[in-house]
Amino acid sequence: LVKTRRDASGDLLNTEAHSAPAQRWSMQVPAEVNAEAGDAAVLPCTFTHPHRHYDGPLTAIWRSGEPYAGPQVFRCTAAPGSELCQTALSLHGRFRLLGNPRRNDLSLRVERLALADSGRYFCRVEFTGDAHDRYESRHGVRLRVTAAAPRIVNISVLPGPAHAFRALCTAEGEPPPALAWSGPAPGNSSAALQGQGHGYQVTAELPALTRDGRYTCTAANSLGRAEASVYLFRFHGAPGTST
């Protein structure tokens, strides 16, 4: 028999154990996890509990902002005896359980981090069988998502309509970088078409390369800038390019 009492935060604490000594409820999380925007991060969370061989139904929950009341970003439920925690909620489909709750591990994986993901995250486990019990981390883990300086991931010259050529530049960064083209012809930079940004990547197109020479794509955000160039040399008399 294990007697419990609630602490001020509503968590159940093991206060007295008769017969075999049991573990107390506790949760171990790091104070902080750092990751770069666009990458993935793991929010570690392990726990101990007083229910020696609990094999009943359980629910694992992660919430953001504040404990007990913050919005849930992830929730999964494991059936009695099962090591599989079936996902019931994964905000924007970016949260996945890495740990195994049956092995006291609630570690969470967050994909494609954005600056807005920065903040505190709190893990919680609920035993919903005979041993009706629950526990949530009070201090949580702070996720610090750092911005990413621009990086040009692709620059290329492609055939365009009527034997013309066009240039594409794709860059990534967080915040998403602004792209600009410059080239040998006057007004080239103003002709750049800013394409759709996808995630942390932005593409700009220079629709018509009217002169031979060097075309430079510049990507810039608050953390810095990056440049890359392509060269267009047409062999006059025959359509072709050297880049």
């Epitope: 990458d39 993935a40 599989l84 092995r103 991931v153 996808h198």
Partner: antibody, heavy 122, light 111 residues
Framework: QVQLVQSGGGLVQPGRSLRLSCAAS????????MHWVRQAPGKGLEWVSG????????GYADSVKGRFTISRDNAKNSLYLQMNSLRAEDTALYYC???????????????WGQGTMVTVSS | QSALTQPASVSGSPGQSITLSCTGT?????????VSWYQQHPGTAPKLMIY???NRPSGVSDRFSGSKSGNTASLTISGLQAEDEADYYC???????????FGTGTKVTVL
């Protein structure tokens, strides 16, 4: 429809290089990790390399580390494997495969290319 | 790292159920719920049948199901059919580097 079309295999001498390409279509290429998996004649599957959606994270099997380089060009919906210092034991059918997730390491491979044979022999 | 262990061959009669095993360690199958199963017919590319232990991609028959206990994952094929005759490979995420390990493969024969 969703497909991966491979090119670039062939017969090469030990110590030489080869570049494999994989052209993707029918899905948003830059949403997913991509992988190379190989299968030696009459043998099982071996994961070779993986690359995350934005090339931010890359992994290699120990057997190819330092010799092979994976890369992707999201603007061209293409995946590449540059193979240098090839050895006889690299002889295999090489498959490119699409992952289910943006990160390559916790992944499964739901779309596969047709495979391209690489034979390393003198 | 070592490949996951699978039986070399398993056979069954049409309509029967068979179960393929995939045994790993506490660093891979036992530690994580990231086990996948692939079917490969001769001369063709592998096909994903199960991911994350028990999830079926769309288009895969519900005769295929996955489960896991301890360090062993299982693929069950119920109502065995002639077209199920193929090689089957399991794969798992592992805490070592590199993060993937495949199984040795099982040849399924429909008698």
């Amino acid at each position: 429809q969703v497909q991966l079309v491979q090119s670039g295999g062939g017969l090469v001498q030990p110590g030489r290089s080869l570049r494999l390409s994989c052209a993707a279509s029918g899905f948003t290429f830059d949403d997913y990790a991509m992988h190379w998996v190989r299968q030696a004649p009459g043998k099982g599957l071996e994961w070779v390399s993986g690359i995350s959606w934005n090339s931010g994270s890359i992994g290699y099997a120990d057997s190819v580390k330092g010799r092979f380089t994976i890369s992707r060009d999201n603007a061209k919906n293409s995946l590449y494997l540059q193979m240098n210092s090839l050895r006889a034991e690299d002889t295999a059918l090489y498959y490119c495969a699409k992952g289910l997730w943006p990160s390559y390491d916790l992944d499964a491979f739901d779309i596969w290319g047709q495979g391209t044979m690489v034979t390393v022999s003198s | 790292q070592s490949a996951l262990t699978q039986p070399a061959s398993v056979s069954g009669s049409p309509g029967q159920s068979i179960t393929l095993s995939c045994t790993g360690t506490s660093s891979d199958v036992g530690a994580y719920n990231f086990v996948s199963w692939y079917q490969q017919h001769p001369g063709t590319a592998p096909k994903l049948m199960i991911y994350e232990v028990s999830n079926r991609p769309s288009g895969v028959s519900d005769r295929f199901s996955g489960s896991k206990s301890g360090n062993t994952a299982s693929l069950t094929i119920s109502g065995l059919q002639a077209e199920d005759e193929a090689d089957y490979y399991c794969s798992s995420y592992t805490s070592t580097i590199p993060p993937f390990v495949f199984g040795t493969g099982t040849k399924v024969t429909v008698l």
